[in-house]
C-alpha cells in the first residue's frame, strides 16, 4: 500500500536570518514533495443525486481519473465492496452489465465513467443517508474505490451550480503536460534539498487538526476535503439498507436480485459531453479500503471532483470479486 504523504505544519522560522524568503523556501520543498509523491495517483469520484420528481429515485455517477484502462466497475451500497456492501451493478467494458434490484439502469457514460439509476419501494428503497460506493478495477493501476451519499440537508434534485466542470478524462496532452511540470518540480526539489543540506533542519510538529487527514493535494481544488476528518465506517447510518438481505450468506448478497433483462450495452460509449455535467456540492465521500471514510466539503465552482483516493491495499480484485465470496 502506498504511504500517505502528510504535509506537516511548519513552525515559523526564527525572525531575522531568513525572514519571509526563508519561510517560502521551507514550505516549497514540502509542497513539491507532496506533488512528487502524489504524482500519477488515480482517483475515483462519486456523485449521488436524488431526483426531485421521484423521491425514492437516486442517480449515482462514478468516474475514474487515471490513465489506465478500466477492466471492471462495481457499484455497491451500505459500504465499500467486501466490507459489508451489497452489490448493485457490475459493469465490464467488453462483456456488458449485470445489475440487481433496486438498480433500474446501469450504463457507461464514457469510457471512464458510469451511471446507475436506482429506485425502489418498501424494503429495498434507498434513502438520503445511504452510502454508495464505486470500485474501479483498472489495468494496470489496480483497484480504487470511493464512496458518496447525500447529506441529510440536501434538497431533492439539488445539484451543483450549472457551471461546466473540467473534462473528466486524462488525455494525452494533459498527462504529458503534468508529467513535465512534475519532473521539473521534482528536479527543483532535489536542487533545494541539496542547497539546504548543510542548514539545520526546521522543527516540525504534526498537524493538530487531524492526524489522519488525507494528504494535501498540490493542486488541491477543495481545501475542506484536505482537512476532512476520518471516522470509523461503523458510524455510517445504513438504516435504509434493504431489510430483506439474505443474511444466511456471509457476503451479504441480496436474495431478491432483479429478474428482468439488463441494459444490453456491451461496450462503453465514446467519451460523452461530461464536461457539462454539474458535480454536486457536498455529499461526496473519500473511501479507504481499511474501513475509514471522510466527507468531502463543498468545492468551489469550476473545479472537478478532487477526492483523495486510497488504493486497495490487497491489489486488484483482492476479494476475488465484488461480493467477496469464497
Amino acid at each position: 500500500m502506498r504511504t500517505e504523504a502528510q504535509v506537516p505544519a511548519l513552525q515559523p522560522p526564527e525572525p531575522g536570518l531568513e525572514g519571509a524568503m526563508g519561510h517560502r523556501t521551507l514550505v516549497l520543498p514540502w509542497v513539491l514533495l507532496t506533488l512528487c509523491v502524489t504524482a500519477g495517483t488515480p482517483e475515483v469520484w462519486v456523485q449521488v443525486r436524488m431526483e426531485a420528481t421521484e423521491l425514492s429515485s437516486f442517480t449515482i455517477r462514478c468516474g475514474f481519473l487515471g490513465s489506465g484502462s478500466i477492466s471492471l466497475v462495481t457499484v455497491s451500497w451500505g459500504g465499500p465492496n467486501g466490507a459489508g456492501g451489497t452489490t448493485l451493478a457490475v459493469l465490464h467494458p467488453e462483456r456488458g452489465i449485470r445489475q440487481w434490484a433496486p438498480a433500474r439502469q446501469a450504463r457507461w457514460e464514457t469510457q471512464s465513467s458510469i451511471s446507475l439509476i436506482l429506485e425502489g419501494s418498501g424494503a429495498s428503497s434507498p434513502c438520503a443517508n445511504t452510502t454508495f460506493c464505486c470500485k474501479f478495477a483498472s489495468f494496470p493501476e489496480g483497484s480504487w474505490e470511493a464512496c458518496g451519499s447525500l447529506p441529510p440537508s440536501s434538497d431533492p434534485g439539488l445539484s451543483a451550480p450549472p457551471t461546466p466542470a473540467p473534462i473528466l478524462r486524462a488525455d494525452l496532452a494533459g498527462i504529458l503536460g503534468v508529467s513535465g511540470v512534475l519532473l521539473f518540480g521534482c528536479v527543483y526539489l532535489l536542487h533545494l534539498l541539496r542547497r539546504h543540506k548543510h542548514r539545520p533542519a526546521p522543527r516540525l510538529q504534526p498537524s493538530r487538526t487531524s492526524p489522519q487527514a488525507p494528504r494535501a493535494r498540490a493542486w488541491a481544488p477543495s481545501q475542506a476535503s484536505q482537512a476532512a476528518l476520518h471516522v470509523p465506517y461503523a458510524t455510517i447510518n445504513t438504516s435504509c439498507r434493504p431489510a430483506t438481505l439474505d443474511t444466511a450468506h456471509p457476503h451479504g448478497g441480496p436474495s431478491w436480485w432483479a429478474s428482468l433483462p439488463t441494459h444490453a450495452a456491451h461496450r462503453p460509449q465514446g467519451p460523452a459531453a461530461w464536461a457539462s455535467t454539474p458535480i454536486p456540492a457536498r455529499g461526496s465521500f473519500v473511501s479507504v479500503e481499511n474501513g475509514l471514510y471522510a466527507q468531502a466539503g463543498e468545492r468551489p465552482p469550476h473545479t472537478g471532483p478532487g477526492l483523495t483516493l486510497f488504493p486497495d491495499p490487497r491489489g486488484p480484485r483482492a476479494m476475488e470479486g465484488p461480493l467477496g465470496v469464497r
Partner: antibody, heavy 117, light 107 residues
Framework: EVQLVESGGGLVQPGGSLRLSCAAS????????MHWVRQATGKGLEWVSD???????YYLDSVKGRFTISRENAKNSLYLQMNSLRAGDTAVYYC????FGHGMDVWGQGTTVTVSS | DIQMTQSPSSLSASVGDRVTITCRAS??????LGWYQQKPGKAPKRLIY???SLQSGVPSRFSGSGSGTEFTLTISSLQPEDFATYYC?????????FGGGTKVEIK
C-alpha cells in the same frame, strides 16, 4: 459447502435431444453467472454457454440455434437443452459458476453426453 | 474470437523443478485471465484469477504474471501432486476461450 451437481447425460443418437441439469447449493445462486463448459475425451476444455443473473444468454457459435441455456433461480438450477445433437457434441459437460467479471471459480463434477448411432 | 496459444503443450520435469507455462492472447485481454489445473477424471480447479492473484487454498508455489497479451504460470518448486494438465482461460469477451493445455509429466 459450495457445490454444483450435473445430471441428465447419456447416450443419444445424432439428431436427438438431451436436457442437462445442474443443481447448485451452498451459495446464493442468483448472484452468479452460470456456464456450461465441455471436454471431449483426451481433448481440451471448450466453453459452451453463459447465462447472466437476469437471463442474458451467450453461446459458442457452433451450438447457437441448437442449444438453449436457462436457469431457475427459485430452484437453484441451471439447464442446457441440447437439440439436433451431433457426434462432435460428445463430451463431458461441466456446470461452472462465475462471479461476473471475475472468472469461473467453482466447477461441477461433470456429466457425460455421448452422441452415437 | 480471441485465440489463446498455450506453450509448451507438454513438458517433463522432476520434483523440485521450477516450471513455467505461457499463454498468449491474440488480442489484449487486460488481466481477465485464470489458470486451471486438471487431473485425469476430475473437474478443473482454479489456481490463479485476475492473471496474478492466488486462489484461496492454493499453495504459494503457484504464481501468475502478465497482462494484456502475455501471461505466465510459474510453479516454483514442483511437487508430486502437481503433475497434471494446466489450462489458461480468458474471460474478457465472448466466446470465452481456453488455451490448448500443458501436460506436466514426471521426468
Amino acid at each position: 459447502e459450495v457445490q454444483l451437481v450435473e445430471s441428465g447425460g447419456g447416450l443419444v443418437q445424432p439428431g436427438g435431444s438431451l436436457r442437462l441439469s445442474c443443481a447448485a447449493s451452498g451459495f446464493t445462486f442468483s448472484n452468479y453467472d452460470m456456464h456450461w463448459v465441455r471436454q471431449a475425451t483426451g481433448k481440451g476444455l471448450e466453453w459452451v454457454s453463459d447465462i447472466g443473473n437476469a437471463g442474458e444468454t451467450y453461446y459458442l457459435d457452433s451450438v447457437k440455434g441448437r442449444f438453449t441455456i436457462s436457469r431457475e433461480n427459485a430452484k437453484n438450477s441451471l439447464y442446457l437443452q441440447m437439440n439436433s445433437l451431433r457426434a462432435g457434441d460428445t463430451a463431458v459437460y461441466y456446470c461452472v459458476r462465475e462471479e461476473f467479471g471475475h472468472g469461473m471459480d467453482v466447477w461441477g463434477q461433470g456429466t457425460t453426453v455421448t452422441v452415437s448411432s | 474470437d480471441i485465440q489463446m496459444t498455450q506453450s509448451p503443450s507438454s513438458l517433463s520435469a522432476s520434483v523440485g523443478d521450477r516450471v513455467t507455462i505461457t499463454c498468449r492472447a491474440s488480442q489484449g485481454i487486460r488481466s481477465d485471465l485464470g489458470w486451471y489445473q486438471q487431473k485425469p477424471g476430475k473437474a478443473p480447479k482454479r489456481l490463479i484469477y485476475a492473471a496474478s492473484s492466488l486462489q484461496s487454498g492454493v499453495p504459494s508455489r503457484f504464481s501468475g504474471s502478465g497482462s494484456g497479451t502475455e501471461f505466465t504460470l510459474t510453479i516454483s518448486s514442483l511437487q508430486p501432486e502437481d503433475f497434471a494438465t494446466y489450462y489458461c482461460l480468458q474471460h474478457n469477451s465472448y466466446p470465452f476461450t481456453f488455451g490448448g493445455g500443458t501436460k506436466v509429466e514426471i521426468k
